[in-house]
Interface confidence: medium
């Protein structure tokens, strides 16, 4: 099939390949302090790390990209580490009528892959 | 709202920001020459280019990532250019019983964004 098996062990050493990492950010960091009330600090999971050949390939396109990057590194970029899924979070914010709770579905990464 | 407006004009100059580019690849390049019969050459659209602050942000997460990259560039990577959608392609390939046509939904990028 078109799918070579995505590799899950990192050939670059521990913590170097695409993975989920938690970054603390305040509302001030995000520029949201004027409208978001709570929480004032968010635990933001983000995708960081490198994408060596076939590591956690998102799909066939990513596998092709990895292969062509090996052949034409100046023309085709390596796959990069991006969210594969998200964890919804709740923010409390100001509205015209007071305060409300709102869910954001695409704010915090839950999983990562190489695309 | 959490969504600042993603920027669509490239501040780095023409062709430098995240966009779709066509790459020619033979079945030999892809390592598929033993099982794919046709086409012998593929026009592969791929996502290339940089993702400056808020350019074509995929979602709220990407906007946050861009902002935190500005604050902590060593810790948080910049968003990167990946497919937002795909164009299905049909490949003719060998099977145990002869030849068949198969559609691949995730092989050729149709649009790009910064994630």
């Amino acid at each position: 099939s078109a799918h070579a098996h995505p590799r899950d062990s990192c050939p670059l050493g521990p913590g170097r390949c695409c993975h989920l990492e938690t970054v603390q950010a305040t509302l001030e960091d995000l520029g949201w302090s004027d409208w978001v009330l709570s929480p004032r600090q968010l635990q933001l999971s983000m995708c960081v790390g490198e994408c060596p050949h076939l590591y956690r390939s998102a799909n066939t396109h990513a596998q092709i990209k990895a292969r062509l990057h090996g052949l034409q590194p100046d023309k085709v970029p390596a796959p990069c580490c991006v969210p594969s899924s998200y964890t919804p979070v709740v923010l409390m914010h100001r509205t015209d009528s007071g305060v409300s709770l709102q869910t954001y579905d695409d704010l915090v990464a839950r999983g990562c892959h190489c695309a | 709202s959490a969504h600042a407006h993603p920027r669509d004009s490239c501040p780095l100059g023409p062709g430098r920001c995240c966009h779709l580019e066509t790459v020619q690849a033979t079945l030999e390049d892809l390592g598929w020459s033993d099982w794919v019969l046709s086409p012998r050459q593929l026009q592969l659209s791929m996502c290339v280019g940089e993702c400056p602050h808020l350019y074509r942000s995929a979602n709220t997460h990407a906007q946050i990532k861009a902002r935190l990259h500005g604050l902590q560039p060593d810790k948080v990577p910049a968003p990167c250019c990946v497919p937002s959608s795909y164009t299905p392609v049909v490949l003719m390939h060998r099977t145990d019983s002869g030849v068949s046509l198969q559609t691949y939904d995730d092989l050729v990028a149709r649009g790009c964004h910064c994630a």
Epitope: L37, S38, T87, P88, V89, V90, V99, L101 | -
Partner: antibody, heavy 119, light 107 residues
Framework: QVQLVQSGAEVKKPGASVKVSCKAS????????INWVRQAPGQGLEWMGW????????NYAQKLQGRVTMTTDTSTSTAYMELRSLRSDDTAVYYC????????????WGQGTMVTVSS | DIQMTQSPSSVSASVGDRVTITCRAS??????LAWYQQKPGKAPKLLIY???SLQSGVPSRFSGSGSGTDFTLTISSLQPEDFATYYC?????????FGGGTKVEIK
């Protein structure tokens, strides 16, 4: 560790007011909101309202609107809940609780303050 | 307001039993449901948040599931210290609301 410590039990006459305090420690007070929840004897939990410690913005339960006021003092990391025009059916244990947080949980609770309204 | 309906209101069980408590929201609340345990004279304790995430320090015999309007708390093997009252709570929107509680009693 994260703790919310409330003021002691109160006995009040109908028509009076009560002010319960809730002192936070072990976390950044202004990073969360404080909920007030009460529980009448033998009954379930009733949410009274919420205040953000950071800005003082509030959201009160409709049935208590006009009788309840929630405030915070960031210099002492303390939240307050004042309930006025007390009636016998306000007799309850009053809890402060931190949250909701990022995942909508109310995760840390005070030990509770018993308020008895009796003539 | 979103009404939270818990069932059963009480359940008699023995140590080692599997106990399931359900909670139904009057409208969709995504995954914004928490479960609390309360023992007499004590404050509630958070067990499960975001419908299925186990709070740190809570034994793995407790699990939560569900999304939208129907949710379940399961205690896989009831222990003596689990006899208590359990409440569900939604934080999808204000006002925050609680279920009526389920008392787990010794059979």
């Amino acid at each position: 560790q994260v703790q919310l410590v409330q003021s002691g039990a109160e006995v009040k006459k109908p028509g009076a007011s009560v002010k319960v305090s809730c002192k936070a420690s072990g976390y950044t007070f202004t990073s969360y909101g404080i909920n007030w929840v009460r529980q009448a004897p033998g009954q379930g939990l009733e949410w009274m309202g919420w205040i953000t410690a950071y800005s003082g913005d509030t959201n009160y339960a409709q049935k208590l609107q006009g009788r309840v006021t929630m405030t915070t003092d960031t210099s002492t990391s303390t939240a307050y809940m004042e309930l006025r025009s007390l009636r016998s059916d306000d007799t309850a244990v009053y809890y402060c609780a931190r949250g909701p947080g990022q995942y909508a949980d109310v995760d840390v609770w005070g030990q509770g303050t018993m308020v008895t309204v009796s003539s | 307001d979103i009404q939270m309906t818990q069932s059963p209101s009480s359940v008699s069980a023995s140590v080692g039993d599997r106990v399931t408590i359900t909670c139904r929201a009057s409208q969709g609340i995504s995954s914004w449901l928490a479960w609390y345990q309360q023992k007499p004279g004590k404050a509630p304790k958070l067990l499960i948040y975001a419908a299925s995430s186990l709070q740190s320090g809570v034994p793995s015999r407790f699990s939560g599931s569900g999304s939208g309007t129907d949710f379940t708390l399961t205690i896989s093997s009831l222990q003596p210290e689990d006899f208590a009252t359990y409440y569900c709570q939604q934080a999808n929107s204000f006002p925050i609301t609680f279920g009526g509680g389920t008392k787990v009693e010794i059979k």
